[in-house]
């Protein structure tokens, strides 16, 4: 049909800055190259009806849907989403193509569904399908990697049973310590599943998809160095594999080492050597102890022997079951104002812990680090100082973990206070939660000094505003103290602070700031 | 046999260091640890590190830390503890031991000791 | 850091007594225990190591027991070379620690 437009349908997918949720046509992100969607006539239709290749989309991730119709003369368009229409502003880019887009920020599943566009151009008319679609993320997983001899050769294979086929790359390190950080210049990523470079002083395996990333460190004692704080300790669930690489330097190849459980040695087929010369002509040689599948009777001291080198020995631990131990008793702090602190929680976990830190219903992440007495710690620092209950919540494949924190930050009293024609209230944050007197203001006591007991009801059911504590105290009023100004002070060991109030005749209440002492 | 020989008693004033030496023979140097312990008059055994001779790599107490270096020179299989900024408190007999070669931070042979007196 | 506790801190017994030594750790340490002998002046010389073996050339009448916390050293039949200052020191974790010791003297 010679008088049909040329279409053409493309996908931006954007990266989200946490632009605000809507629909619009304006920019308000980083975009990725478009990606064609081959916008085909739909056969058999009534009319002239184009059908975009169909979207899958990520939860909560943003994307614009662009039609680009070379076609002579003004369009006019409506776009149509679940019997909605929508406002459409079609412009002209630089080939002088009319250009219409429909921005969907943050996906949710109510903005998934069939979003159709009527154009009209001085030609003809025509509508565009496009189905959009959320991505079934819940078939998808990330499995922690794990290790493979390659057959016949000295290498390993680095395998993660995850959906969608996740990217595997090798992190190799050379130096001690903190300089093996993620992002530390000593660190090298090989993007491949096989290894042959086996002698590094850390490797590491990590597969990542869009579940995010997961790492497998290789066991390793180094019998040049010290051993760890405490005897290193190994957990595996009944059928993982098992790795254990002894790594010893000598200034000539006369040396061998051995592999011994429970001081016997291990059969053949569970060990195998490699060697090589260093820059320095010293030999390295490393022997690595493997089981495909553990079982329980693979428990025990696993002791790395060498003829030259002191020898070390692992803790293997077989377990049923996935665990996390650490105390779950509450914590309750109480700290200054410009005080340093951070809440941490010391745990041993296997497999490794997802955890987040939670306050206030917000999220925050969470960081692990693990220590050499086998223990590993996650510190939260960023509280900023704000009262409250933090939660910190970890869980691994087969446990979970809840421990709760209370922070109150020791200050002075603030006052605020109100009053209806029967009372008079005040309130005050403040830490520790502070006590009340009343005083009467008269010519008898201009300073006043002349103190109220009757009629005062302190609350001390305190209610959570915010995570802060408040206190109150009310006034009933009575003739004797009616027309008079009265005050309520609150004071606690960091100080006083205190309000004045002119209990006047039924009507607006003026209230005084008094100093804060 | 296994023998670990230290050098001789010191006498030191505060604030001075001392280096203490062990000389080992009748077994492989660089197949065993070797850790060094303190013992003040009438008082307890007092762990102050340990030295893996293969590497030189060390761990020290936390107590000890910044104060004490322990090195080892494996043509002679001798190790080294050297302790400076010294105190009375530091008054003791310090002994070299080797660690034992399977039990994990076991000790199985003791050196004679050496005292250090701190006095000015 | 892992403390160890000794008790009795002394004791008196007499030649061919049965001597029992406990020592206690603030924290499971399994079977990494070591028993150390010392007389006056002398360096300690290693009994019993892993809790309950015991060190070649060591007498017989020398016994370690214990797993986790508990530990004890039993000497079956006192000699008279027996009588000096007995020592535990767990053998898991640095720094390594030492229990006060026990001192078997002469009733």
């Known amino acids: 049909n010679q008088d049909l437009p040329v279409i053409k349908c493309v996908l931006i997918n954007h990266k989200n800055n946490d632009s605000s949720v809507g629909k619009s046509s304006s920019y308000p992100m980083v975009s990725e190259s478009p990606e064609d969607l081959g916008c085909a006539l739909r056969p058999q239709s009534s009319g002239t009806v184009y059908e975009a290749a169909a979207v899958e989309v990520d939860v909560s991730a943003s994307i614009t849907l662009q039609v680009l119709v070379d076609a002579p003369g003004n369009i006019s368009c409506l776009w149509v989403f679940k019997h909605s229409s929508l406002n459409c502003q079609p412009h002209f880019d630089l080939q002088n193509r009319g250009v219409v887009s429909m921005v969907i920020l943050k996906m949710t599943e109510t903005q998934a569904g069939e979003y159709l566009l009527f154009i009209q151009s001085e030609a003809t008319n025509y509508t565009i399908l496009f189905t959009v679609s959320i991505r079934n993320t819940l078939l998808y997983t990330l499995r922690r990697p794990y290790f493979r001899k390659m057959e016949n050769q000295d290498a390993l294979v680095c395998i993660s049973e995850s959906v969608p086929e996740p990217i595997v790359e090798w992190v190799l390190c050379d130096s001690q310590g903190e300089s093996c950080k993620e992002e530390s210049p000593a660190v090298v990523k090989k993007e491949e599943k096989v290894l042959h470079e086996l002698f590094g002083t850390d490797i590491r395996c990590c597969a990542r998809n869009e579940l995010g990333r997961e790492c497998t460190r290789l066991f390793t004692i180094d019998l040049n160095q010290t051993p760890q704080t405490t005897l290193p300790q190994l957990f595996l669930k009944v059928g993982e594999p098992l790795w254990i690489r002894c790594k010893a330097v000598h200034v000539n190849h006369g040396f061998g080492l051995t592999w011994e459980l429970e001081n016997k040695a291990l059969e053949e087929g569970n060990y195998f050597e490699m060697s090589t010369y260093s820059t320095n002509r010293t030999m390295i040689r490393i022997l690595f102890a493997f089981v495909s599948s553990v079982a329980r009777n693979d428990t025990g001291y696993y002791t790395c022997s060498s003829s030259k080198h002191p020898s070390q020995s692992a803790l293997v631990t077989i377990v049923e079951k996935g665990f996390i131990n650490a105390t779950n008793s509450s914590e309750d702090y109480e700290i200054d104002q410009y005080e340093e602190f951070c809440f941490s929680v010391r745990f041993k976990a296997y497999p490794q812990i997802r955890c987040t830190w939670t306050f206030s219903r917000k999220s925050f992440p969470c960081e692990q680090k693990g220590l050499d007495n086998g223990y590993s710690i996650s510190k939260f620092c960023n509280h900023k100082h704000q009262p409250g209950e933090y939660i910190f919540h970890a869980e691994n494949d087969d446990a979970q973990f809840t421990k709760m924190f209370t922070l109150n930050i020791r200050r002075k009293p603030q006052v605020l206070a109100e009053a209806s024609a029967s009372q008079a209230s005040c309130f005050s944050d403040g830490y520790p939660l502070p006590s009340w007197t009343w005083k009467k203001c008269s010519d008898k006591s201009p300073n006043c000094t002349e103190e109220i007991t009757e009629g005062v009801w302190n609350r001390k059911a305190n209610r959570k505003v915010f995570g802060q504590w408040v206190s109150s105290s009310t006034l009933n009023m009575s003739e004797a103290i009616k027309g008079f100004l009265v005050k309520c002070c609150a004071y606690n060991s960091l100080g006083t602070s205190c309000e004045t109030i002119l209990l006047n005749s039924p009507g607006p209440f003026p209230f005084i700031q008094d100093n804060i002492s | 046999q296994v023998q670990l020989v230290q050098s001789g008693a010191e006498v030191k004033k505060p604030g001075a260091s001392v280096k203490v030496s062990c000389k080992a023979s009748?077994?492989?140097?660089?197949?065993?640890?070797m850790h060094w312990v303190r013992q003040a008059p009438g008082q307890g055994l007092e762990w102050m590190g340990i030295?893996?001779?293969?590497?030189?790599?060390?761990r020290y107490a936390q107590k000890f830390q910044g104060r004490v270096t322990m090195t080892r020179d494996t043509s002679t299989s001798t190790v080294y503890m050297e302790l400076s900024s010294l105190r009375s408190e530091d008054t003791a007999v310090y002994y070299c031991?080797?660690?034992?070669?399977?039990?994990?931070?076991?000790?199985?042979?003791w050196g004679k000791g050496t005292t250090v007196t701190v006095s000015s | 850091d892992i403390q160890m506790t000794q008790s009795p801190s002394s004791l008196s017994a007499s030649v061919g007594d049965r001597v029992t030594i406990t020592c206690r750790a603030s924290q499971s340490i399994s079977t990494w225990l070591a028993w150390y002998q010392q007389k006056p002046g002398k360096a300690p010389k290693l009994l019993i190591y892993?809790?309950?073996s015991l060190q070649s050339g060591v007498p017989s009448r020398f016994s370690g027991s214990g797993s986790g916390t508990d530990f004890t050293l039993t000497i079956s039949s006192l000699q008279p070379e027996d009588f000096a200052t007995y020592y535990c020191?767990?053998?898991?974790?640095?720094?390594?620690?030492f229990g006060g010791g026990t001192k078997v003297e002469i009733k």
């Open positions: 892993a809790a309950s």
């Open positions: 030295i893996n001779p293969s590497g030189g790599s060390t």
């Open positions: 020191q767990q053998a898991i974790s640095f720094p390594l620690t």
């Open positions: 031991a080797r660690g034992s070669s399977y039990y994990y931070y076991g000790v199985d042979v």
């Open positions: 009748g077994y492989s140097f660089t197949t065993h640890y």
